[in-house]
């Protein structure tokens, strides 16, 4: 379809780099959540940091291209990296408007499918880009 994808846009304080240039921020009349209309893909992404007690959103926005996973209607995150011991970054890609607003489910920490404690380690900030 010719019309463009619109995604939720968020970048946590302290996250290095930005995906803002991959789209055009929209005026939605409310401060949050922000919306971004993608320039180069029809695909949204989300990154959450899962610790023992909670999941915290790190980044949401547009992908730079359409890749495997972008055909998903919903955000189904999969584990990608360990920014620090006890926390895991989960990412999703999906291809409907605002599909990255929230995830459908996250596996509990340490459950099968979550990288073990020997998984990739990264410095804060770098891990976000590893996940992307």
């Amino acid at each position: 379809p010719p019309n463009r994808r619109t995604c939720v846009f968020f970048e946590a304080p302290g996250v290095r780099g930005s995906t803002k240039t991959l789209g055009e921020l929209l005026d939605t009349g409310t401060e949050l959540p922000r919306a971004i209309r993608c320039l180069y893909s029809r695909c949204c992404f989300g990154i959450w940091n899962l610790t023992q007690d909670r999941a915290q959103v790190e980044m949401q926005g547009c992908r730079d291209s359409d890749e495997p996973g972008c055909e998903s209607l919903h955000c189904d995150p999969s584990p990608r990296a360990h920014p620090s011991p006890g926390s895991t970054l989960f990412t999703c890609s999906c291809g409907t408007d605002f599909c990255n607003a929230n995830y459908s489910h996250l596996p509990p920490p340490g459950s099968p499918g979550t990288p073990g404690s020997q998984g990739p380690q990264a410095a804060p900030g770098e891990s976000i880009w590893m996940a992307l």
């Epitope: 010719p2 619109t6 929209l26 009349g29 919306a35 320039l39 180069y40």
Partner: antibody, heavy 117, light 111 residues
């Protein structure tokens, strides 16, 4: 300041390929932006042809998709248009343009290409 | 493709008066209330120059005599007051859907 300059042959024979170069100064084509080709026909109708973006991804106007290719040389900060199987209907002034968003803030001066035997 | 129809094709306005140019889209160019319609000025022998983006935002360095308004399918570029330097052809462009398309142009002359 971002500046763009088109160059290439001003005369192309029918059925041959049209090849143009856009040289960008004042900004790296790998930093940001989409780098577009837009043409203006005699009579002034404007047509967006396609772009190559900072990461090298391309998007083309479906009306040209079978004939068009946009590539780049990052070492020279240039991007290129190739249009195959041209006819007299492709006679136009060809502009390169840079866009951070979905409108065109930066334009070259344009180069007239005539398709004629 | 979205077709943009500009009217009038040409107009003549006295210096100091108001010029109004219309652009009508064959379908809405709005996304969640944001209008993806833009306006350009082109003088003979020059490339188009961005005046207004997203319906009503004035590009940096463009005089406040230029303004844009409208939403969905109906948009207007207003020049008030018109100056001699405004003699040019004006184009609208939509970017709500691919491919981007332009209007046919409106030629502004001084009466």
């Amino acid at each position: 300041d971002v500046q763009l300059q088109e160059s290439g042959p001003g005369l192309v024979k029918p059925s041959q390929s049209l090849s143009l170069t856009c040289t960008v100064t004042g900004y790296s084509i790998t930093s940001d932006f989409a780098w577009n080709w837009i043409r203006q026909f005699p009579g002034n109708k404007l047509e967006w042809m396609g772009y190559i973006n900072f990461s090298g991804s391309t998007s083309y106007n479906p009306s040209l998709k079978s004939r068009i290719s946009i590539t780049r040389d990052t070492s020279k900060n240039q991007f290129f248009l190739q249009l195959n199987s041209v006819t007299t209907e492709d006679t136009a002034t060809y502009y390169c343009a840079g866009s951070r968003y979905s409108w065109f803030a930066y334009w070259g001066q344009g180069t007239l290409v005539t398709v004629s035997a | 493709d979205i077709v943009l129809t500009q009217s009038p094709a040409s107009l003549a306005v006295s210096l100091g008066q108001r010029a109004t140019i219309s652009c009508r889209a064959s379908e809405s160019v709005d996304t969640y209330g944001n209008s993806f319609m833009h306006w350009y000025q082109q003088k003979p022998g020059q490339p188009p120059k961005l005046l207004i983006y997203r319906a009503s935002n004035l590009e940096s360095g463009i005089p406040a005599r230029f303004s844009g308004s409208g939403s969905r399918t109906d948009f207007t570029l207003t020049i008030n007051p018109v100056e001699a330097d405004d003699v040019a052809t004006y184009y609208c462009q939509q970017s709500n859907e691919d491919p981007y398309t332009f209007g046919g142009g409106t030629k502004l002359e001084i009466k």
